[in-house]
Amino acid sequence: KKEDGESTAPTARPKVLRCKCHHHCPEDSVNNICSTDGYCFTMIEEDDSGTPVVTSGCLGLEGSDFQCRDTPIPHQRRSIECCTERNECNKDLHPTLPPLKDRDFVDGPIHHK
């Protein structure tokens, strides 16, 4: 039941967005394309051996603002870029790893828990 003053106009449904996915393809993806109500992303991060790994895919609307904010994580070199302006927009995203800090040279790629 609608409360007094509550709009009866239907809320706009999000339009599905198609994104390229690589190393991050969900079970419903086809030909390395996934679908989302949120953002396309491309991310670069170091694996346990210090090798840069690029992944791309779909981020759902819920929580994606936080995930796309690219807040630095101690002892983890990682960068993420997000987009929504067109389908497969993440094909054109090329995030780069943040520069090594002095302490990172000492710690190496070991991730402290």
Epitope: R13, R18, P26, S29, V30, S35, D37, R86, N87, E88
Partner: antibody, heavy 117, light 113 residues
């Protein structure tokens, strides 16, 4: 209100091509995907493909690749589907339908395509 | 391609009776990321275009009478008409929108006795 207007019928010769139209009104064309669906008598519904009018990005059912080409004219809010090398198998009702997600919340009235000499 | 199978292919019911029709998919339509089933139901009255009744397996489209109830999860889905009316004479189709190409069931024809 949302309307998808399609011509009622088209009669085309075998081997020819046809361009079916779907004029959208009552909503912002670029906020929804536009789909095309084929229905032959007694053979249910078949999804042909879809187009995002905002960037003309298309997806096709592999069964219709090479047969159907989807385009859109934003200035007239009209979506088009061109069907080539027509045979009697292409005789059917063709619907346009819009979606936000990939369920179809508004449908055109359909164009009956007859391929005959 | 995901195969959608509907049963029965036709049924005849009297006004006021409860109707149930089944739709089965060849693979699960439940998306793990949001726990939604990517299945829709449509009604097509004679000489008309299809009309959306239910999406995400159980969400009734705005303006659809509440006698139409969608249920099920994974691979098994049901459309129930709690008390059939004369105007419900139509073909009913299910559609999966989990993975491209989107596919429809063969339909259930509802006749009124």
């Amino acid at each position: 209100q949302v309307q998808l207007q399609q011509p009622g019928a088209e009669l085309v010769m075998p081997g020819a091509s046809v361009k079916l139209s779907c004029k959208a009104s009552g909503y912002t064309l670029t906020n929804y995907w536009m789909h095309w669906v084929k229905q032959r008598p007694g053979q249910g519904l078949e999804w042909i493909g879809d187009i995002d009018p905002s960037d003309t990005y298309t997806n096709y059912n592999h069964k219709f690749k090479g047969k159907a080409t989807l385009t859109v004219d934003k200035s007239s809010s009209t979506a088009y589907m061109q069907l080539s090398s027509l045979t009697s198998e292409d005789s059917a009702v063709y619907y346009c339908a819009r979606s936000g997600w990939d369920y179809f919340d508004s449908w055109g009235q359909g164009t009956t395509l007859t391929v005959s000499s | 391609d995901i195969v959608m199978t509907q049963s029965p292919s036709s049924l005849a019911m009297s006004v006021g009776q409860k109707v149930t029709m089944s739709c089965k998919s060849s693979q699960s339509l439940l998306k793990s990321s949001n726990q939604k089933n990517y299945l829709a139901w449509y009604q097509q009255k004679p000489g008309q275009s299809p009309k959306l009744l239910v999406y995400f397996a159980s969400t009734r489209e705005s303006g659809v009478p509440d006698r139409f109830i969608g249920s099920g999860s994974g691979t098994d889905f049901t459309l129930t008409i709690s008390s059939v009316q004369a105007e419900d004479l139509a073909d009913y189709f299910c559609q999966q929108y989990y993975r491209i190409p989107w596919t429809f069931g063969g339909g259930t024809k509802l006749e009124i006795k």
